[in-house]
Interface confidence: medium
Amino acid sequence: HSDGIFTDSYSRYRKQMAVKKYLAAVLGKRYKQRVKNK
């Protein structure tokens, strides 16, 4: 079970990292800035 939990967490982490990488590529420094609105 602990292996499953670790794998699931790592999978989520990998997805989060992929999203961050995508955002950084598309947005550059904007990704870290305050100029964003809903």
Partner: antibody, heavy 127, light 114 residues
Framework: QSLEESGGGLVQPGASLTLTCTAS?????????MCWVRQAPGKGLEWIAC????????TYYASWAKGRFTISKTSSTTVTLHVTSLTAADTATYFC????????????????????WGPGTLVTVSS | DVVMTQTPSPVSAAVGGTVTINCRAS??????LAWYQQKPGQPPKLLMS???TLESGVPSRFKGSGSGTEFTLTISDLECADAATYYC????????????????FGGGTEVVVK
């Protein structure tokens, strides 16, 4: 789609002025950053301020423009720039410009470039 | 804040020739660069964004290249209508919390067509 500025002219030093930008062919119900940029005679482009046209209405100013310049959205097709304590250094053509914004994962980020510009309105500050 | 420096100005070439305009950023801005054309008495016109992506209606004679800190706008098969001042603008935003990305324009390069 077009933008048009109005309100420029000859003004006395120390006076205040309100410039208006009117959009045609599109409305601010879409999410943009509407901005003001000025250009002194024979000089380069100088960004002044932007406002997000969505519900937040967030405003952004160049560091030198804070306090004396105020940008506002006054209707679904108009944005104004109010300027106080005008000096000769404010003599310039004032352009209204649209930042089309980047829609990414539910947020509208500034594109940081301007895809539509108005023809400009000349403000001359002189006694 | 990012500082954009353009060279040379003015630059001239004959009709049918080629001109190259350089734009240098004071820090790495990846490919986040836009180019504008401004003719006397007119507002600037966006030519391209993201270094090389042409806006609709802009002829393919206009070509943008570069990345990082060094960028180039090349205009080939020059026409009289290309006589204008060209501005680059960093579109990467600002790494400073006290400024924004809209204010990073180059000083402009005048193109004279002979």
């Amino acid at each position: 789609q077009s933008l048009e500025e109005s309100g420029g002219g000859l003004v006395q030093p120390g006076a205040s002025l309100t410039l208006t930008c009117t959009a045609s062919g599109f409305s601010f119900s879409s999410n943009y950053y509407m901005c003001w940029v000025r250009q002194a005679p024979g000089k380069g482009l100088e960004w002044i301020a932007c406002i997000f046209t969505g519900s937040s209405g967030s405003t952004y100013y160049a560091s030198w423009a804070k306090g004396r310049f105020t940008i506002s959205k006054t209707s679904s097709t108009t944005v104004t720039l109010h300027v106080t304590s005008l000096t000769a250094a404010d003599t310039a053509t004032y352009f209204c410009a649209r930042d089309r914004a980047l829609s990414v994962v539910g947020y509208f980020y500034a594109a940081y470039y301007f895809d539509f510009w108005g023809p400009g309105t000349l403000v001359t500050v002189s006694s | 804040d990012v500082v954009m420096t353009q060279t040379p100005s003015p630059v001239s070439a004959a009709v049918g020739g080629t001109v190259t305009i350089n734009c240098r950023a004071s820090e790495d801005i990846e490919s986040f660069l836009a180019w504008y054309q401004q003719k006397p008495g007119q507002p600037p016109k966006l030519l391209m964004s993201r270094t090389s992506t042409l806006e609709s209606g802009v002829p393919s004679r206009f070509k943008g290249s570069g990345s990082g800190t060094e960028f180039t706008l090349t205009i080939s098969d020059l026409e009289c209508a290309d006589a204008a001042t060209y501005y680059c603008q960093c579109t990467d935003g600002s790494s400073s919390s006290s400024s924004y990305g809209w204010d990073a324009f180059g000083g402009g390069t005048e193109v004279v067509v002979k």
